[in-house]
Amino acid sequence: EPPTACREKQYLINSQCCSLCQPGQKLVSDCTEFTETECLPCSESEFLDTWNRETRCHQHKYCDPNLGLQVQQKGTSETDTICTCEEGLHCTSESCESCVPHRSCLPGFGVKQIATGVSDTICEPCPVGFFSNVSSAFEKCRPWTSCETKDLVVQQAGTNKTDVVCGPQDRQR
């Protein structure tokens, strides 16, 4: 009797279990009682990444330079193109359809993780003993100057945005 369920990598149509097309190929015709499924390779600008019964291949993603995108990995008949962002930019989403400039860490914050083409700058507040007095996408919090090692004393305490100010020791006895 005609099957009601099919094996893996098959599909049921007209009471027949037909083979799915392998990745990189599209369906031309379903199998029949007497013939196999017929599949054709996707063209150069197209892909299919699963065993399928699609009659059309998917277009490779276009990495639009006007959106700050560039090709990270060229697509094949079985994989989509992977886009990334140009230097100084990162993707706005996981699918990387557009790019925005990396954010800078404001004074009082330092760079915890430098941005990549797919992730933004991660900032962290400068802890006690560290400061950042610039807005930067690269600079970490810097330690306060150690006045003692210079045989100086702290004249003005540091903050998360300013370094300490060192001065000469009081020579009075």
Partner: antibody
Framework: EVQLQESGPGLVKPSETLSLTCTVS?????????WNWIRQPPGKGLEWMGY???????NYNPSLKNRVTISRDTSKNQFSLKLSSVTAADTAVYYC?????WGQGTTVTVSS | DAVMTQTPLSLSVTPGQPASISCRSS???????????LNWYLQKPGQSPQLLIY???NRFSGVPDRFSGSGSGTDFTLKISRVEAEDVGVYYC?????????FGQGTKLEIK
């Protein structure tokens, strides 16, 4: 219900070309399947002659030595057989078939 | 070509008794996907062949369940569990895995 019906002359002279047409109803010959011609000489078994596919491409039995051509007219949902340089050995009942559905067959006699 | 050899060429069976026909191919009929395209037909006297079994063991629609097909590779069998008077005719196997498609020479079933 898929139906196939052969038509054409029942008598062909030796050395001439045998021409038959198969009219299909209930299914488009461009949708899928292979559309075959099969013959059966009197009192003998079945012989596959060739097919035309849903996409118009062909395959023929090499035993017929390039004498066979199968073509189609998609506007009429018909496919046709031509067999050239016939001899008495080509006398047979000729069937068109989708392999699950067959025509009733038409007898062709080759005689002068 | 895949040469199809049927045995026996004729058999005479009492109604209600079983019957078995063998079909052997000169080459494997299993394709690269693991599918085997072997059909069985019955040609009743004065009629076109009718499909009984396709892909070795699948009964065509409307075919009684007393007909069954089995086999793999090069050896195939058609079984009739209980022969009835209407089963008389010539049985053919046909392979459509390889081009040219080829028929067995036929097995004539008679009723005792």
């Amino acid at each position: 219900e898929v139906q196939l019906q052969e038509s054409g002359p029942g008598l062909v002279k030796p050395s001439e070309t045998l021409s038959l047409t198969c009219t299909v109803s209930g299914y488009s010959i461009t949708s899928n399947y292979y559309w075959n011609w099969i013959r059966q000489p009197p009192g003998k078994g079945l012989e596959w002659m060739g097919y035309i596919r849903y996409d118009g491409s062909n395959n023929y039995n090499p035993s017929l030595k390039n004498r066979v051509t199968i073509s189609r007219d998609t506007s009429k949902n018909q496919f046709s057989l031509k067999l050239s340089s016939v001899t008495a050995a080509d006398t047979a009942v000729y069937y068109c078939a989708r392999l699950d559905y067959w025509g009733q067959g038409t007898t062709v006699t080759v005689s002068s | 070509d895949a040469v199809m050899t049927q045995t026996p060429l004729s058999l005479s069976v009492t109604p209600g008794q079983p019957a078995s026909i063998s079909c052997r191919s000169s080459q494997s009929l299993e394709n690269t996907n693991g599918n085997t395209f072997l059909n069985w037909y019955l040609q009743k006297p004065g009629q076109s062949p009718q499909l009984l079994i396709y892909r070795v063991s699948n009964r065509f629609s409307g075919v009684p369940d007393r007909f069954s097909g089995s086999g793999s590779g090069t050896d195939f069998t058609l079984k009739i569990s209980r022969v009835e008077a209407e089963d008389v005719g010539v049985y053919y196997c046909l392979q459509v895995t390889h081009v040219p498609f080829t028929f067995g020479q036929g097995t004539k079933l008679e009723i005792k």
